[in-house]
Amino acid sequence: GWVWNQFFVPEEMNTTSHHVGRLRSDLDNGNNSFQYKLLGAGAGSTFIIDERTGDIYAIEKLDREERSLYILRAQVIDITTGRAVEPESEFVIKVSDINDNEPKFLDEPYEAIVPEMSPEGTLVIQVTASDADDPSSGNNARLLYSLLQGQPYFSVEPTTGVIRISSKMDRELQDEYWVIIQAKDMIGQPGALSGTTSVLIKLSDVNDNKPIFKESLYRLTVSESAPTGTSIGTIMAYDNDIGENAEMDYSIEEDDSQTFDIITNHETQEGIVILKKKVNFEHQNHYGIRAKVKNHHVDEQLMKYHTEASTTFIKIQVEDVDEPPLFLLPYYIFEIFEETPQGSFVGVVSATDPDNRKSPIRYSITRSKVFNIDDNGTITTTNSLDREISAWYNLSITATEKYNIEQISSIPVYVQVLNINDHAPEFSQYYESYVCENAGSGQVIQTISAVDRDESIEEHHFYFNLSVEDTNSSSFTIIDNQDNTAVILTNRTGFNLQEEPIFYISILIADNGIPSLTSTNTLTIHVCDCDDSGSTQTCQYQELMLSMGFKTE
C-alpha cells in the first residue's frame, strides 16, 4: 500500500525547491526498481517528484491566499515489468499560512456624524479591517484595534472596532475630528502586521446656545409721514448654533404706546422693526421699546440653555415732515335758504398747519360760480340760489399753506339749499275734457290733480275752487276730494254743440304754504255729438278724434 503523511508546504518560501514530503509504496525495498510519477494540475510546474525516492518538492513560491490546496495523483511503476505496483491514488498538499498580510480597512473612507454634547459611551461608528491570512491558523488574522489619534474624545473597543465617545465635545469649539485607528494582527503580539484608517467624525449641532443681541442699544429713525407697515430698521441677534437651531423669533417685550411691531426675516435671521400705528412728530417725537429674541425650535431637554431670553433697547426718533394743512372736520355740511341775496353767509371752514411753524392758511373753492371763500374760511354766495334748480351743492375746499404752496389739503363741503314756498301748485298735466250734448246734471266730466315744485315741509295739501266767474256761470261745478284731487261735474242738463261747442273753465289751486300761493289753471271742455243712448263709446271716439286734431262732423 501507499505510505505518506499529510503534506503541508508553507507559503511564500523563497528557496528554489522546498521538500514537501515523501510518497512511497510499502513494497519499495530501496533497490531503485520503482519509478514514482506525479499527475494533475501543478505537477511538473509547481510540484515535482523524485522518481526514485518519491520525495516531493515545491519548486515555486506559493501563495495560500491565492490557492490553499492542491489535489494531485500519484503512480508507482515497477521499472522491470512496466506495471503499476500500486493503484493510482489522490493526495492533498495543503499550503500552510504565514502572517504575510496586513489588516486592511476595505470600507474606506469612513465618515460618521454624532451630535455634539453626546454623553460618554455613545457609539459613533464601527470600523472593520480584513486580514487575508487564514483565520484558522493561529493568530495570523486575529485583530486588535487601537486609537492612534483622537484622544481624549474617542476610544475604540479593541476586539470590535467600535468607536465610542469618551469625552463631551462642543461643536461650537470644534466641529470635526480626524480619528486614526490601527488594526494589528497576531492580537498585537511581536511580529504583528498593522494597517490604519482615518475616520472623519463630524459633530452635528444641538440647540445648546440661545441667540444673543450683540448690541444693547439700537437707534432708529422714522419719518412721521411713514405709512403703517413701514420697515424702519433691522436688529440682529447672533446664535452660535447652525441651521434650524439658529432660527430665531424676535418680539417686542415693552412698548407702552403699542406703536411698533417686530417681524422676523427667517432667511436672514434679522428682526425687522415695523410701524404699527402712524406717528406724529408734533405729538411725540421719540419712543423707546424693548425687544427680545428666542430660538424658533427648542427641545424640552435643552430648555436649560434657553431660560432667559436676550433683550435689547431700541430708541426711535421721529423725523418731522412738513405736513399739509389739517381741517378741523373731515367734511362740512351747511344749510342756506333759497332766494337769499348774493353775498349771503353759508358757513365757515377751518384748517391749521399741524407743524410747529403754524403757517397761515389760504382757502379756495374748486370750480364754483355760486360760492366764494375768503382767507378766514368764510363761505358766501355769489348768486341767489334756487332749490328747484339745485337742492345740494358738493364743493371741494382747498387749504394751502402760505409759506409752502405745495402743502395742500382738500375736503368736501356739502351745501343744502333749503326750501321756501315760492311756487304755486298747478295741474299735474294738460287736461282736455268732453261732455255729451245729452249729458245730465251731476255727471263727472274730469278728475284733476296738482303738483307743486316746492319741497313739502310735512305734506302738500291743495285746495281746488272755480273762479268767481265760472262759479256764477254754473254750467259746471267742482268738488275737492281732500286728497289733492278734485272732480269736475256738470251743473245742468243738456249742451248744444252748435251754440256752445267749447267751455274754458278757470280752476284755482291753492297750497298750504305760508304764505299760501294760488294759481289759475284752465280746463278745456268740448261738447260732443253723442248717440241717443248716450253711448260713451261714441263720445270716447269723438273725444279721441278731437284730441288728435280731427274735426268730427
Epitope: 499527475l39 494540475a41 510546474s45 491565492e66 490557492r67 489535489i71 476595505l106
Partner: antibody, heavy 120, light 108 residues
C-alpha cells in the same frame, strides 16, 4: 451577491487587438481564494478557457492562446481585462467573464457574455 | 491536455423521463475537480454540480452527479420543460482547464 458584467467593442478589425473589461459588483475582486477568468464560445460551438488572474497579478493562460493573451486587473476599479492581439475571423465568439474557485476550479458566477465579431 | 468527451451529442427525451449524460476523460481526473454546467440559448452557462456530486446553490434535487477516475455522469431523475438545454462537463485536474463538447438535451 457577486455579479459580473462584460463591456467592450462588438466589432474588431482583423490583425487588431480585442479589448474587453469585466466589472465586478456585489463583492471585492481583492478577495482571496478566487481567480477571475475569461472563457469564450465560438458560434454554435463549445466552451474554451482563455485564462485567469489572481488579484495580486499572477496569471494563468491556455497554452493554445498564451502568445496572444494578456489579462490584467485593476483592484481600485474592481475590474479585470482581456487583451487578445492579432485577431482573425476565428476569434469571433461570445466572450464570458467568470469567477473561479481557486482550490477546486469551478466557474460561478458568470457574466451574461458579449459577442465580438472580427471583420473588416 | 485532458480531453473530455460527452455522449450522446444529442439526447431526445420527453418531460417526466430520466436523462443520463456521460462525460469521459482522456486521463484520470480527481472527483473534486469535475463540474457540470447548463446553458440555455442566448444565456451564459450556469453551474449545476461541482466536485462531481455537489449541487450548486438553488439547483433542484432532481439533478445529481456521480463518477470517478475517467467516467462521470450527470443524471436528471425526472425531466421538467425548463431542463431542455445544452450540458457541459469541465475539469480542473490538469492544465489547461478544459470543457467537454456538450450534450444537447431536446424535447422528443
Amino acid at each position: 451577491q457577486v455579479q459580473l458584467q462584460e463591456s467592450g467593442p462588438g466589432l474588431v478589425k482583423p490583425s487588431q487587438t480585442l479589448s474587453l473589461t469585466c466589472t465586478v459588483s456585489g463583492g471585492s475582486i481583492s478577495s482571496g481564494g478566487y481567480y477571475w477568468s475569461w472563457i469564450r464560445q465560438h458560434p454554435g460551438k463549445g466552451l474554451e478557457w482563455i485564462g485567469y488572474i489572481f488579484y495580486r497579478g499572477r496569471t494563468y493562460y491556455n497554452p493554445s492562446l498564451k502568445s496572444r493573451v494578456t489579462i490584467s486587473v485593476d483592484t481600485s476599479k474592481n475590474q479585470f481585462s482581456l487583451k487578445l492581439s492579432s485577431v482573425t475571423a476565428a476569434d469571433t465568439a461570445v466572450y464570458y467573464c467568470a469567477r473561479v474557485y481557486s482550490n477546486y476550479g469551478w466557474f460561478d458566477p458568470w457574466g451574461q457574455g458579449t459577442l465580438v465579431t472580427v471583420s473588416s | 491536455e485532458i480531453v473530455l468527451t460527452q455522449s450522446p451529442g444529442t439526447l431526445s427525451l420527453s418531460p417526466g423521463e430520466r436523462a443520463t449524460l456521460s462525460c469521459r476523460a482522456s486521463q484520470s481526473v480527481s472527483s473534486s475537480y469535475l463540474a457540470w454546467y447548463q446553458q440555455k440559448p442566448g444565456q451564459a452557462p450556469r453551474l449545476l454540480i461541482y466536485g462531481t456530486s455537489n449541487r450548486a446553490t438553488g439547483i433542484p434535487d432532481r439533478f445529481s452527479g456521480s463518477g470517478s477516475g475517467t467516467d462521470f455522469t450527470l443524471t436528471i431523475s425526472r425531466l421538467e420543460p425548463e431542463d431542455f438545454a445544452v450540458y457541459y462537463c469541465q475539469q480542473y485536474g490538469s492544465s489547461p482547464l478544459t470543457f467537454g463538447g456538450g450534450t444537447k438535451l431536446e424535447i422528443k
